[in-house]
């Protein structure tokens, strides 16, 4: 065998069983651990790059990664690994994560394009909304491309609608 271990990282435990569960997802005990952005293919007997299958029907094992990859292809959006959702930068400009810096900084130069709430935020009138449902929580489990924690950010109902649209 040659070439199969090139992208593996050390320190991951592996077990001897290699099988698929009925749903096509790897079963907890029976799967081998793979580096992030890879999955265990039991027929091939190796870890495979999720990138290779994002264009195929068989995305079950890499659904989150593929959503993230597709999201990053869209301008003005980023994938939040905590929310597991594709977030529109337009909805959070003003207190945006670094992934939205380019988009928001260009947007903020022409505030006419911003929704009223964000124009108010831009001029210092941050809404005092006690509903924490839209708050971004920091997480140590985020992927390397996840947004930084934004504990102070609260989103209005309108903004949440944009975030989840």
């Amino acid at each position: 065998m040659s070439g199969l271990g090139r992208s593996r990282r050390g320190g991951r435990s592996r077990v001897d069983q290699e099988e698929r569960s009925p749903q096509g997802l790897w079963t907890g005990v029976a799967m081998r651990s793979c580096p992030e952005e890879q999955y265990w293919d039991p027929l091939l007997g190796t870890c495979m790059s999720c990138k290779a299958i994002c264009n195929h029907q068989s995305q079950r094992t890499c659904a989150t990664f593929c959503r993230s990859l597709n999201c990053r292809k869209e301008q003005g959006r980023f994938y939040d690994h905590l929310l597991r959702d594709c977030i529109s930068c337009a909805s959070i400009c003003g207190q945006h994560p670094k992934q939205c810096a380019y988009f928001c900084e260009n947007k903020l130069r022409s505030p006419v394009n911003l929704p009223p709430e964000l124009r108010r935020q831009r001029s210092g009138e941050v809404e005092n909304n006690s509903d924490n449902s839209g708050r971004y929580q920091g997480s140590e489990h985020r992927g390397s491309e996840a947004s930084p924690a934004l504990p102070g950010l609260k989103l209005s109902a309108d903004q949440l609608a944009l975030v989840y649209s």
């Epitope: 009925p22 096509g24 039991p42 091939l44 495979m48 790059s49 195929h56 029907q57 068989s58």
Partner: antibody
Framework: QVQLVQSGAEVKKPGASVKVSCKAS????????MHWVRQAPGQRLEWMGY????????KYSQKFQGRVTITRDTSASTAYMELSSLRSEDTAVYYC???????????WGQGTTVTVSS | DIQMTQSPSSLSASVGDRVTITCAAS??????LNWYQQKPGKAVKLLMR???RLHSGVPSRFSGSGSGTDFTLTISSLQPEDFATYYC?????????FGGGTKLEIK
């Protein structure tokens, strides 16, 4: 449409090597794993090995380990299977097959007959 | 390696007949069982993946069932073009393994 076209029949002497080619068309060659499977007369299909689409990684059946080498030329969308130290029991039809990522082989080449005879 | 046992090894039938071929795995393979059709001098064709999902272009007279270790391929009404050899293959464990084949002949 997806097509895998293999090279023509070969007759080899024991101890020699054979290299079979498989030209792919109708899809992005580097998006799929290519496998090689053989079938000796009157025998079942037998998996030999595969090559990964993105880093030339290979994995072989223990039975053929050390005798088989699978390579590819991405610019020509072609995969190759070379079997060395041929013996009479290697007389078989050799197939390339595309892996569909879900445990099955969705497209196969037409097969290449290799005859090993002194 | 997982052993795949197909039965019968050969079968004679007539056009219009309903035919069933079975495949048994030596250990649980969930639903990762595929069926292929092979005709002399032609490329092997995938008929069915994941026990019962027809591959594109395969007629609906072919159906599959089973789970775990026991599986069947059924042809509801044999057509002249269906006379061929059929193979099962497990896609659940490395390395992939195939059944011994069932040769379907005209009676």
């Amino acid at each position: 449409q997806v097509q895998l076209v293999q090279s023509g029949a070969e007759v080899k002497k024991p101890g020699a090597s054979v290299k079979v080619s498989c030209k792919a068309s109708g899809y992005t060659f580097t998006n799929y794993v290519m496998h090689w499977v053989r079938q000796a007369p009157g025998q079942r299909l037998e998996w030999m090995g595969y090559i990964l689409p993105y880093n030339d990684g290979t994995k072989y059946s223990q039975k053929f380990q050390g005798r088989v080498t699978i390579t590819r030329d991405t610019s020509a969308s072609t995969a190759y299977m070379e079997l060395s130290s041929l013996r009479s029991e290697d007389t078989a039809v050799y197939y390339c097959a595309r892996y569909d990522w879900e445990g099955s082989f969705d497209y196969w080449g037409q097969g290449t007959t290799v005859t090993v005879s002194s | 390696d997982i052993q795949m046992t197909q039965s019968p090894s050969s079968l004679s039938a007539s056009v219009g007949d309903r035919v069933t071929i079975t495949c048994a795995a030596s250990q649980d393979i969930s639903n990762y069982l595929n069926w292929y059709q092979q005709k002399p001098g032609k490329a092997v064709k995938l008929l069915m993946r994941y026990t019962s999902r027809l591959h594109s272009g395969v007629p609906s007279r072919f159906s599959g069932s089973g789970s775990g270790t026991d599986f069947t391929l059924t042809i509801s009404s044999l057509q002249p073009e269906d006379f061929a050899t059929y193979y099962c293959q497990q896609g659940n464990r490395f390395p992939p393994t195939f059944g011994g084949g069932t040769k379907l002949e005209i009676k």
